[in-house]
């Protein structure tokens, strides 16, 4: 039991100059047809240095970037660098914790969409700029106090019962994300991420939609409806173009298949 506790201690405390940052266990809640985004990252947040397929971290390169700071300024420590994989064509999964730890927060790569107000938010880092040959997904490790904002995906309209945000908080030695009060309905209208929004306390999430840490004997099952829930990504214009392209290709293939089938049918009729 002591070694287990020691391991937990190492896993959940990151030494940040001047303070200890407590990692949030598990992901923010998933809302059907919604995505989330952090507008700024609390000191102690880690971002994995991931490289796209065919590339790998440079030897002796950082495993992750770390949001650190002093009383006046916060910035990302370490730099992620990717180099061509001369050997195998695989992307090595770099995580500062063992794989059992469900500490992965993924956001799809995007051009840093950063509201102006976040630059001066004390104790927070802005979205780090992309690095060369970066993987398409960013894996963040959030800390207690982190807030993420939700918006409905394109084609869905937001019904707010309260704040569309989730905060990672710690009580009774366990971390959990509060439940955002957002429902996305299938009407053609999208909601926007806030440019500047004052943090509000979200209603309490309970065990069905939360996480715990330390001597946790069983994994939590997130029982919220997952149907059609998008990954924790932000839909960029590039993404939308890619989707549109895929849809166009699919329709083209179907049309061509249909025409080919019709011709075959005519041929077979002729031979009878």
């Amino acid at each position: 039991m002591d070694s287990y506790l020691l391991m937990w201690g190492l896993l959940t405390f990151i030494m940040v100059p001047g303070c200890q940052a407590e990692l949030c266990d598990d992901d923010p809640p998933e809302i059907p047809h919604a995505t989330f985004k952090a507008m700024a990252y609390k000191e102690g947040t880690m971002l994995n240095c991931e490289c796209k397929r065919g590339f790998r971290r440079i030897k002796s390169g950082s495993l992750y970037m770390l949001c650190t700071g002093n009383s006046s300024h916060s910035s990302w420590d370490n730099q992620c660098q990717c180099t061509s994989s001369a050997t195998r064509n695989t992307t090595k999964q770099v995580t500062p914790q063992p794989e059992e730890q469900k500490e992965r927060k993924t956001t799809e790569m995007q051009s840093p969409m950063q509201p102006v107000d976040q630059a001066s938010l004390p104790g927070h880092c802005r979205e780090p700029p992309p690095w060369e040959n970066e993987a398409t997904e960013r894996i963040y490790h959030f800390v207690v106090g982190q807030m993420v904002y939700y918006q409905c995906v394109q084609g869905y309209r937001a019904l707010h019962r309260g704040p569309a945000e989730s905060v990672c908080k710690m009580t009774h030695g366990k971390t959990r994300w509060t439940q955002p009060q957002l429902i996305c309905t299938g009407e053609m209208e999208t909601s926007q991420f806030p440019g500047e929004e004052k943090p509000q306390a979200s209603p309490e999430g309970r065990p069905e939609s939360e996480t715990s840490c330390l001597v946790t004997t069983t994994d939590f099952q997130i029982q919220t409806e997952m149907a059609a829930t998008m990954e924790t990504s932000i839909f960029t214009t590039e993404y939308q173009v890619a989707v549109a392209g895929c849809v166009f290709l699919l329709i083209s293939v179907l049309l061509l298949s249909g025409l080919t089938w019709q011709r075959r049918q005519r041929k077979s009729r002729r031979t009878i």
Partner: antibody, heavy 118, light 106 residues
């Protein structure tokens, strides 16, 4: 109404184990963490640990680790706390408490008196 | 380890008095502090959560406040039913209770 009903008083010998039950009613049992708190005669409150009734995940205070086992039976909305290798200083009233409003303990069981005596 | 220092341990007061109980945390606990009232032979009863939020059904004469790591429970006008023992409870890092304050009749 929302309530927690605990099992009756127990008298145990040192070295033995005791299992206290806590039956929840009036709310969704799996929707709230259940905590165990004890109070020795004339003393203050001491937190022992929690169980997530939804998953069965548990977490106990370092003082009780290795001696306390928290379980639940969701079919009968009941949480259990078993304390082993009992000593005389384990004589106390044991409470189950629901972690509710604002993450504080909003609903408490009536308590179970456990006496450890040779 | 978190320490919750509650004071005073005993408080003698009369009906109608304004009563103040203090709890000091050994380190920051955000606002994760609750206050409970306990009467002899009974289970504790939640009064205040998140330092200053009054539980529904609890009389408004009870209030909670915080200033850094110091938390205060105030009973604006003590009633006969209020003579009991009061506990503070931090639940930021696991759970720790204060030693208790017994409010007795003067």
């Amino acid at each position: 109404q929302v309530q927690l009903v605990q099992s009756g008083a127990e008298v145990k010998k040192p070295g033995a184990s005791v299992k206290v039950s806590c039956k929840a009613s009036g709310y969704t049992f799996t929707g709230y963490y259940m905590h165990w708190v004890r109070q020795a005669p004339g003393q203050g409150l001491e937190w022992m640990g929690w169980i997530n009734p939804n998953s069965g995940g548990t977490n106990s205070a370092q003082k009780f680790q290795g001696r306390v086992t928290m379980t639940r039976d969701t079919s009968i909305n009941t949480a259990y706390m078993e304390l082993s290798r009992l000593r005389s200083d384990d004589t106390a009233v044991y409470y189950c408490a629901r972690e509710g409003e604002g993450d504080a303990f909003d609903i408490w069981g009536q308590g179970t008196m456990v006496t450890v005596s040779s | 380890d978190f320490q919750m220092t509650q004071s005073p341990s005993t408080l003698s007061a009369s009906v109608g008095d304004r009563v103040t109980i203090t709890c000091r945390a050994s380190q920051s606990i955000s606002s994760w502090l609750a206050w409970y009232q306990q009467k002899p032979g009974k289970a504790p009863k939640l009064l205040i959560y998140e330092a200053s939020s009054l539980k529904s059904g609890v009389p408004s004469r009870f209030s909670g406040s915080e200033s850094g790591t110091e938390f205060t429970l105030t009973i604006s006008s003590l009633q006969p039913d209020d003579f009991a023992t009061y506990y503070c409870h931090q639940y930021n890092s696991y759970s720790t209770f204060g030693q208790g304050t017994k409010v007795e009749i003067k």
